[in-house]
């Protein structure tokens, strides 16, 4: 019998600082370019190898960024939410929120879930 | 981290067709822009199609324009190399190859052009 997937949501302030290739990830979303139904907002669609959030480790690809400096990412257009990181200035923090999957055992075995994700 | 499964390669007579399909599990699938290269025997691996995470923008190797078209299905998180017309210089292992798509928060100009991130272990093509 499968078990029933679930999430754990999470968020973090992450302060990261600019490094010679900048912050170093990618992003989707936006009132825009919706990359989740119903929801607009700022997700991480890539982490680059070597580059400040890489070497910083915090942030993954999936994440859904709230915040850039106490800004809130909601209702932007797509290259608003771009342009306001690239003027985020030397040092960045961002708020953002972690979702990871847990799989639960079958009904019956609560508490053997192992989180994966 | 993401897994890539390629499949449909094998040995086809010049002027055959063959389709290559690629399987990506690990993340959504939805969100990644995908390509194809291929390594030629004692060649470098080159660039031979990519299509971006949303499906509206497609790049081809000048020498199989008008003979291969990459497309993809979100639906079964699967990336499609179809190949006509095939040519004995099209033999080659074929890879497939994922990144995270989307727009850089640094620069226009920062990602690589053909730069990816994750790679499948690739299938053979031999055109006779």
């Known amino acids: 019998m499968n078990g029933r997937v679930d999430y754990l949501v999470t968020e973090e302030e992450i302060n990261l600082t600019r490094g010679p290739s900048g912050l170093g990830f990618n992003i989707v979303g936006g009132t825009d370019q919706q990359y989740v139904s119903n929801d607009s907002g700022i997700y991480v669609s890539r982490i680059k190898e070597n580059g400040a959030a890489a070497l910083d480790g915090r942030l993954q690809e999936g994440d859904k960024i709230l915040s850039v400096n106490g800004q809130d990412l909601k209702n932007l257009l797509h290259q608003d939410a771009v342009d306001l990181f690239r003027n985020a200035g030397y040092a960045v923090s961002l708020r953002v929120q972690h979702r990871l999957q847990v799989q639960n055992g079958p009904i019956g075995h609560r508490g053997e879930g192992d989180p994966s994700g | 981290e993401v897994q890539l499964v390629e499949s449909g390669g094998g040995l086809v007579q010049a002027g055959g067709s063959l389709r290559l399909s690629c399987a990506a599990s690990?993340?959504?699938?939805?969100?990644?822009?995908m390509g194809w290269f291929r390594q030629r025997p004692g060649k470098e691996r080159d660039v031979v199609a990519t299509i971006n995470w949303t499906g509206d923008s497609t790049y081809y190797l000048d020498s199989v324009k008008g003979r291969f078209t990459i497309s993809r299905d979100n639906a079964k998180n699967t990336v499609f190399l179809q190949m006509n017309s095939l040519k004995p210089e099209d033999t080659a292992v074929y890879y497939c190859a994922a990144r995270g798509g989307g727009s850089s928060v640094d620069s226009e100009y920062d990602d690589g052009e053909f730069e990816y991130d994750y790679w499948g272990q690739g299938t053979q093509v031999t055109v006779s």
């Open positions: 690990g993340r959504p699938f939805s969100s990644l822009d």
